[in-house]
């Protein structure tokens, strides 16, 4: 096992948003790993009368490209590609607020569940933006 | 905006001990997997251990049974405790999580 590298994705969790693309990994094991996780992170949510449609119809997809970013083709050495902070920012303070703020005070959904912080994002105009990951938000196009 | 802080470089003679620490801004459990890389002079950088979120860990064939990564929730905070120090550990140490890197903290092994 050495640093990260890319493979297509095998879940189920997320497949109909990543299919079977390429997607960077920290190690070997790690995508049955967080596959695993997802999973039941999905089943509580499922569950959840938390959350409400607008933010359910992009929460789920980001939190897939968090959890198995695609790899960064543009890159030499393996490298993840990041979410887009506009559309970040959109989901956390606009569509999904709600429902941030009640994952983010539940211990029991962050222990399954990680939520991206908009901060860790490259500022949009930057060039380490020029290449994230972009969910289709309305609002951020 | 830096978003992890290393702390806890030195000097240090063989034999020794240092403890690294990592401090997150924000939640350090937002990341699936966070590390320890190190680079020594003239070399390319190397992962050294890693920790994923369900508590997994890797360390490098060099450091295993010397150095133990470990993670502290509660404090945002990611540590390495360096047992048994050589010279060949002599290298800036950093934090990674994601494509986010701290600045890095200088080990230094030397009698």
């Known amino acids: 096992e050495e640093d990260g590298f890319c493979q297509p994705y095998r879940g189920i969790a997320c497949a109909r948003f990543i299919g079977n693309r390429t997607v960077y990994m920290e190690s070997l094991h790690m995508q049955g790993e967080i596959e695993n996780q997802i999973t039941a992170a999905f089943t509580m949510i499922g569950t959840s009368s938390h959350l409400s449609d607008k933010c359910s119809q992009f929460a789920i997809p980001s939190l897939c490209h968090y959890a198995f970013p695609y790899c960064d083709e543009t890159s030499s050495v393996p490298k993840p590609r990041d979410l887009c902070r506009d559309e970040c920012e959109i989901l956390e303070n606009v569509l999904c607020q709600t429902e941030y703020i009640f994952a983010r005070s539940n211990p029991m959904i962050l222990m399954r569940l990680k939520l991206p912080n908009c901060e860790d994002l490259p500022q949009p105009e930057s060039p380490e933006a020029a290449n994230c990951i972009r969910i289709g938000i309305p609002m951020a196009d | 905006e830096v978003q992890l802080v290393e702390s806890g470089g030195g000097l240090v003679q063989p034999g020794g001990s240092l403890r690294l620490s990592c401090a997150a801004s924000?939640?350090?459990?937002?990341?699936?997997?966070v590390g320890w890389y190190r680079q020594a002079p003239g070399k390319q950088r190397e992962l050294v251990a890693r920790?994923?979120?369900?508590?997994?860990?890797y360390y490098a064939d060099s450091v295993k049974g010397r150095f133990t990564i470990s993670i502290d929730n509660s404090k945002n905070t990611l540590y390495l405790q360096m047992n048994s120090l050589r010279a060949e550990d002599t290298a800036v140490y950093y934090c990674?999580?994601?494509?986010?890197w701290g600045q890095g903290t200088l080990v230094t092994v030397s009698s």
């Open positions: 990674n999580a994601r494509n986010l």
């Open positions: 924000g939640s350090i459990s937002r990341f699936y997997a």
């Open positions: 920790i994923s979120s369900g508590g997994s860990t």
